[in-house]
Amino acid sequence: MKVLQEPTCVSDYMSISTCEWKMNGPTNCSTELRLLYQLVFLLSEAHTCIPENNGGAGCVCHLLMDDVVSADNYTLDLWAGQQLLWKGSFKPSEHVKPRAPGNLTVHTNVSDTLLLTWSNPYPPDNYLYNHLTYAVNIWSENDPADFRIYNVTYLEPSLRIAASTLKSGISYRARVRAWAQCYNTTWSEWSPSTKWHNSYREPFEQHHHHHHHHHHH
């Protein structure tokens, strides 16, 4: 039994790091393998992760961590019974994939403005809480070409857009994801999408003089 692709890990910089690897043949990861991990620090204990299968020869393990600081370094040992298959280390702060934002809501109660809000996936004591920026993806269910991304580079988890920038009378979906420049993270997964019906009334003057204006965006 050999490791074909060495473990690579990403951290949510809060409580979970996920490591994936491939074996040289079909493997029952949970019965045949164990990934031992230990924070390189005083009093730290070794922990055992039981991997799950991820395709025929692939394995994935979710390493649970109490907290994380920038300087953290973990030793990783992959065992098959008494045989050490691979030994490595992992610095969570160098391989961060943020948690996905949640609770995406579209507020349509102001006729000419759409307000999208979502929740920061981190608690205030986490460094990433004040360092996330977001990308909001809005698309039309009717028209695949009507697909847009808004970059939210301020810290507030919200986005205001004029309803008139979208077509009226059709359904749209939105989703949001996060990243943090400070740790050069990858993007998070997208949040679950939310759906709304876009309808707005053009001002009378605009309707009278520029009836087709909004079709030209």
Partner: antibody
């Protein structure tokens, strides 16, 4: 041996500023969060705030926001807390504590007395 | 802020007898990562506090096994199975799950 050694007792006048230090040995402060805890005379423990020494990220209890400023110097392995606009109510013992992820190591405490 | 309320505030126990201290949080202290960071500290007279129990039930290294922690949700308990003279001092519960972190008001244990 792991130790947190704090600077000595201070007596200050109201309105003054004091900066107390906490030097760690036996471990690197970059590997922990460094916290400060207040203990007023004859009273209990109150959490002041904390710092991640590597990136300087601080959080404070609202009571100490604007009153306490926590800093760290990783080259000297030392954490600091500055208390400004001192009042008699700030008279207390202040403990530095390393947390990873519990308060395993405490400094001996620094008594700050505010008196005119 | 989460308020940690300890009862009783003082306790007088005969050596060899058990002691129990209760700590109630004003709301759940389960962290977003699923862990409950409820700890117990003992401050002996003239000393800095020392860690006894972390994550509700785990004894810190070197802590005698007569100390045990239990509880979940918002109700937690520290038990000393047989009190010894060296156990005197003030016991504090602490929650490190939600900012601002908070201590209980302390329970003073003395020997009869």
């Amino acid at each position: 041996e792991v130790q947190l050694v704090q600077s000595g007792a201070e007596v200050k006048k109201p309105g003054a500023t004091v900066k107390i230090s906490c030097k760690a040995s036996g471990f690197n402060i970059k590997d922990t969060y460094m916290h400060w805890v207040q203990q007023a005379p004859g009273k209990g423990l109150e959490w002041v705030g904390r710092i991640d020494p590597t990136n300087g990220y601080t959080i404070y209890a609202s009571k100490f926001q604007g009153k306490a400023t926590i800093t760290a110097d990783t080259s000297s392995n030392t954490a600091y807390m500055e208390l400004s606009s001192l009042r008699s109510e700030d008279t207390a013992v202040y403990h530095c504590v390393s947390r990873r992820p519990w308060f395993a190591y405490w400094g001996q405490g620094t008594l700050v007395t505010v008196s005119s | 802020d989460i308020v940690m309320t300890q009862t009783p505030l003082s306790l007088s126990v005969t050596p060899g007898q058990p002691a129990s201290i209760s700590c109630r949080s004003s709301q759940s202290i389960v962290h977003s990562n699923g862990n409950t960071y409820l700890e117990w500290y003992l401050q002996k007279p003239g000393q800095s506090p020392q860690l006894l129990i972390y994550k509700v039930t785990n004894r810190f290294s070197g802590v005698p096994d007569r100390f045990s922690g239990s509880g979940s949700g918002t109700d937690f308990t520290l038990k000393i199975s047989r009190v010894e003279a060296e156990d005197v001092g003030v016991y504090y519960c602490f929650q490190g799950s939600h900012v601002p972190y908070t201590f209980g008001q302390g329970t003073k244990l003395e020997i009869k």
